[in-house]
Amino acid sequence: SGTTNTVAAYNLTWKSTNFKTILEWEPKPVNQVYTVQISTKSGDWKSKCFYTTDTECDLTDEIVKDVKQTYLARVFSYPAGNVESTGSAGEPLYENSPEFTPYLETNLGQPTIQSFEQVGTKVNVTVEDERTLVRRNNTFLSLRDVFGKDLIYTLYYWKSSSSGKKTAKTNTNEFLIDVDKGENYCFSVQAVIPSRTVNRKSTDSPVECMGQEKGEFREI
């Protein structure tokens, strides 16, 4: 039978940023196809990405139903053109993924500085509240909606003329910092979830500097 050429998937890996979640695996199929199933620890299996030749499956729609749940996925291998066929034990070959808890493990996406405004020796820096694919009452939630006070932002700021950084922290999306009059500053923000043990930090936002378009300056 053709099942002898079927190989089990391996290196099952969750790739997730701001809850956009894709399961990836190997190998590239040769004369075989894959189907993915996902479930919570206590739930039923749901099939996705039926008989695909891809080596990835977007599971976002499933995990956003409850981002605090722990999910397990499995990838089934079938002979191409004979998907009813089973392995030697009467079951199709499959491999389990590692467990995945989106709330604890999704990577924090790169934040964006929305604006900054200087009023005298104070600068207000605002971080864009990025939309996620998590829904509540038919509306998409922002990162802040999902994480609440668990999500903080660290602002790194420095005089354009030097490299030494200062820091500020906020559990909103706004910073109010003191600056020296007549000096231009640059800013970069980082999202952080301190309650995590891994994947705690995002990559830094693009650097924004005073004297560029994003900001506004008012002399008081």
Epitope: T167, K169, P194, T197, K201
Partner: antibody, heavy 121, light 107 residues
Amino acid sequence: EVQLVESGGGLVQPGGSLRLSCAASGFTISEYWIHWVRQAPGKGLEWVGFIDPYNGYTGYADSVRGRFTISADTSKNTAYLQMNSLRAEDTAVYYCARADYYYVDEYWDYWGQGTLVTVSS
Amino acid sequence: DIQMTQSPSSLSASVGDRVTITCRASQDVNTAVAWYQQKPGKAPKLLIYSASFLYSGVPSRFSGSRSGTDFTLTISSLQPEDFATYYCQQHYTTPPTFGQGTKVEIK
């Protein structure tokens, strides 16, 4: 078990250089922030600078800016303090410390044992 | 830079005494204050973070409180192992700054 171990201290002449290491174990430095603090003999604690090993961003006290450089090698899970143009007033025990946050409030929960730097001719 | 003015600089007390150390910030630092204990020849140890939260493993006789820009470390009943120097520290802005220290000595 979380541990920070400093090394590299010693006697150096004024104007000389020294590189201190802070080797971390039990945690991944890129998930945290590392600060350097010093304490002159019989004196209080003075912040020297910090690094975010995740992005390499650093900040320094005015007293050392331009002379000291903090770096990190995440593959070795180690932070460094390169000290140049050393002065007698830099004589101190140097500590590295791990910083974490409770919501937005920072705290330094683990410290190294310290390494003594003596600047004298 | 924010100044942290700590008082007293030293105090003498007996085992069982209630000891209070205060720190005043030169401007608002919200709750971004930590307290550390240091013994001679040793690294500082974290006692209190976020003004009033007891760090894991620290005896419950230690407590911290905040009133505006005034911060207090209290040892409810001094034990022999508590004789040490105590530092407050603000993390609200860069640079983080320490108080001058309070040496608690045996009376």
